[in-house]
Interface confidence: low
């Protein structure tokens, strides 16, 4: 019968001679050269050669276990004289023994990962994996241990799983957003002499709302003409927020001040500015300065960061109302006067008064719009507004006179106002009756 054990052969042999595998031997072999050993199967005659007299097998080439771990061959022992087999053909195995000739290789050259800023220590970031082509069933050639080469003390890696976790408290995106971590995978359980490979992990801290809005200045001042209609924007304020996205969104509100009912603030969603607008008609003569307290706040707040302080800030907004030069204002919308038809020339009928409503109280002069009094029947004292006749009247000719009086600011002739005057001519018995006279 055949006499051998399973053959083992170390891979990656570097010797100058052929590598000895083992010996095929039949108990029928008496050592007299009467038997001939024949090898067939995987690599026979090429990779593996046999001394047909002695049964010694040698490998002619360097073998790579990772390419082929097992070779299955067949052995024959033939009687040289008869040409007959002295043993039944038998299959045998050459098993290639592993050496540590493969370094761990990561599944990706570069990994990309994100983790929220300010995460607790130990927060999962990403798992990296390296594989080793060596034999995992024998020795530690394929036992991979992970370690961090660059990226401490921010991140750590679990040596057995390749799970990267945060290693520092309060990692702040606003201070630093990008981290490049280099992870090493080393075989032989990380021991000396192990082979290693590395990968880069680009980690980005994603934003959380850990920063409140902050006004860059405590006081703002804007001016607006008193003529600004409701809805007019009069100024923009902007609080800055170091966060990004919805964490940096800001809402503005007026929380206090004399102008609470006079102004509004709206948030410009695009620029994240607060736009102060006029809410009610302003009047310089009534109030010249308003002081508001405007608040900027984050609409989306993370409760766990409330200990950092309120997620809002306030600023004082001072609004100065600008005077707009307004025309004189008459004491009445219209005047109705009466005069007897027998009034003498220069008889005073009445008077009108107008006043500059501006704080300057500019003096006013009066005149009659001659388009409304072509016959120049009436006149006005330009200084005091007294209306008097400049011609004799006749009720029978015209019962009502409708004229317009103009009031003009002396210092600013562009500012003028008009008012209608309705003058009624009262009847005087100055006409004899007319009729047909008949004789007796």
């Amino acid at each position: 019968s055949w006499m051998w054990n399973q053959f083992f052969l170390l891979e990656e042999y570097t010797g100058s001679d052929y590598q000895y595998v083992g010996k095929l031997h039949s108990d029928q072999d008496r050592g007299d050269g009467s038997l001939k050993y024949i090898l067939s199967g995987d690599g026979a005659g090429d990779l593996f050669i046999i001394n047909e007299n002695t049964g010694d097998i040698q490998a002619t080439k360097r073998l790579d276990r990772e390419e082929k771990p097992v070779y299955i061959l067949r052995a024959q022992a033939i009687n040289r004289r008869t040409g007959r087999p002295v043993e039944p053909e038998s299959e045998f195995i050459i098993k290639i023994h592993d050496i540590n000739d493969n370094e761990p290789i990561f599944t990706k050259e570069v990994y990309t990962a994100t983790v929220p800023e300010m995460s607790d220590v130990g927060t999962f970031v990403v798992q990296v994996t390296a594989t080793d082509a060596d034999d995992p069933t024998y020795g530690n050639s394929a036992k991979v241990v992970y370690s961090i080469l660059q990226g401490q003390p921010y991140f750590s890696v679990e040596s057995e799983t390749g799970i990267i976790k945060t290693a520092l408290l309060n990692m702040d995106r606003e201070n630093r957003e990008q981290y490049q971590v280099v992870i090493q995978a080393k075989d032989m359980g990380g021991q000396m002499g192990g082979l290693s490979g590395t990968t880069t992990v680009n980690i980005t801290l994603t934003d959380v709302n850990d920063n409140p809005p902050r006004f860059p200045q405590s006081t703002y001042q804007f001016k607006t003409p008193e003529s600004s209609p409701p809805g007019t924007p009069i100024g923009r304020i902007k609080a800055s927020d170091a966060d990004v996205g919805e964490n940096a969104e800001i809402e503005y509100s007026i929380t206090d001040g004399e102008g609470l009912d006079m102004f509004d603030v709206i948030t410009d969603q695009e620029t994240q500015e607060g736009i102060i607008t006029v809410k009610k008609l302003l009047d310089f003569e009534k109030k010249k300065v308003y002081t508001l307290k405007v608040e900027a706040s984050n609409p989306y707040v993370e409760p766990r960061f409330l200990y950092l302080g309120p997620f809002k800030d306030s600023a004082t907004v001072r609004i100065v109302v600008e005077d707009v030069d307004e025309p004189p204002v008459f004491s009445k919308l219209a005047y109705i006067l009466q005069i007897r038809e027998d009034a003498q020339i220069n008889t005073t009928i009445g008077s009108v008064t107008a006043q500059d409503p501006d704080a300057a109280r500019n003096p006013v002069k009066y005149s009659v719009d001659r388009h409304t009094d072509m016959d120049r029947i009436f006149n006005i004292d330009s200084g005091n507004g007294s209306i008097f006749t400049s011609k004799l009247l006749d009720r029978e000719t015209l019962l009502w006179h409708n004229i317009t009086v103009i009031a003009t600011e002396i210092n600013n002739p562009k500012q003028s106002s008009r008012v209608p005057l309705y003058i009624k001519v009262l009847d005087v018995n100055d006409n004899a009756p007319t009729g047909l006279s008949t004789g007796a």
């Epitope: 660059q150 408290l169 309060n170 990692m171 702040d172 606003e174 201070n175 490049q180 280099v182």
Partner: antibody, heavy 122, light 106 residues
């Protein structure tokens, strides 16, 4: 804009103590480490220690252990460095410097105070 | 403790020259290195961090390279305002500065 403004120059006798201040503005004082670095005339820079104003924890260079005390006043956003038992070789410009990271006493220094000259002479 | 060795300790150059300063760490510090510029009577100013990242506002003629234990600061075309002392600093483990390189006018 981040600013660190230090107190003025000091002249001290050997054996005395000196306390240098560093007032911070333009950022949340409690959220960044504050370091102290000194530079002897014509010499290089030497790290002395840090404080985390958020909780007052400190770390000192072994060389100065027992002689240096770093404190912080959160109400005024001011850090202080006190060096005792002064000797002539302590003559140097003392700088405060903000650590770039909020939650880590490592890293580089992104903003520096203007420096305070301390002269130790008898 | 990690020691930082800077070379040369001083150099003379002219405006427009390319200037290279090297810094060697006593052990592997990966890319945990910063470069600072200091002018007489002034505080150091951060130029480069993480070995090769330019600090905001620093002119692009400054660049940093290196990893592990050997690092270089390069000024591609020296300007009049660049005459100063340059320090490297490691922050891999604690803090240590190089002894400085003074760049003087030739």
């Amino acid at each position: 804009e981040v600013q660190l403004v230090q107190s003025g120059a000091e002249v001290k006798k050997p054996g005395a103590s000196v306390k240098v201040s560093c007032k911070a503005s333009g950022y949340t004082f409690t959220r960044n480490f504050m370091h102290w670095v000194r530079q002897a005339p014509g010499q290089g820079l030497e790290w002395m220690g840090w404080i985390y104003p958020g909780d007052g924890e400190t770390e000192y260079n072994q060389k100065f252990q027992g002689r240096v005390t770093i404190t912080a006043d959160r109400s005024t956003s001011t850090a202080y460095m006190e060096l005792s038992s002064l000797r002539s070789e302590d003559t140097a410009v003392y700088f405060c410097a903000r650590g770039v990271y909020g939650g880590f006493a490592g890293g580089y220094f992104d903003f520096w105070g203007q420096g305070t000259l301390v002269t130790v002479s008898s | 403790d990690i020691q930082m060795t800077q070379s040369p300790s001083s150099l003379s150059a002219s405006v427009g020259d390319r200037v290279t300063i090297t810094c060697k760490a006593s052990q592997n510090i990966y890319k945990n290195l910063a470069w600072y510029q200091q002018k007489p009577g002034k505080a150091p100013k951060l130029l480069i961090y993480d070995a090769n990242t330019l600090q905001t506002g620093v002119p692009s003629r400054f660049s940093g390279s290196g990893s592990g234990s050997d690092f270089t600061l390069t000024i591609s075309s020296l300007q009049p305002e660049d005459f100063a002392t340059y320090f490297c600093q490691q922050y891999y483990s604690g803090w240590a500065f190089g002894q400085g390189t003074k760049v003087e006018i030739k």
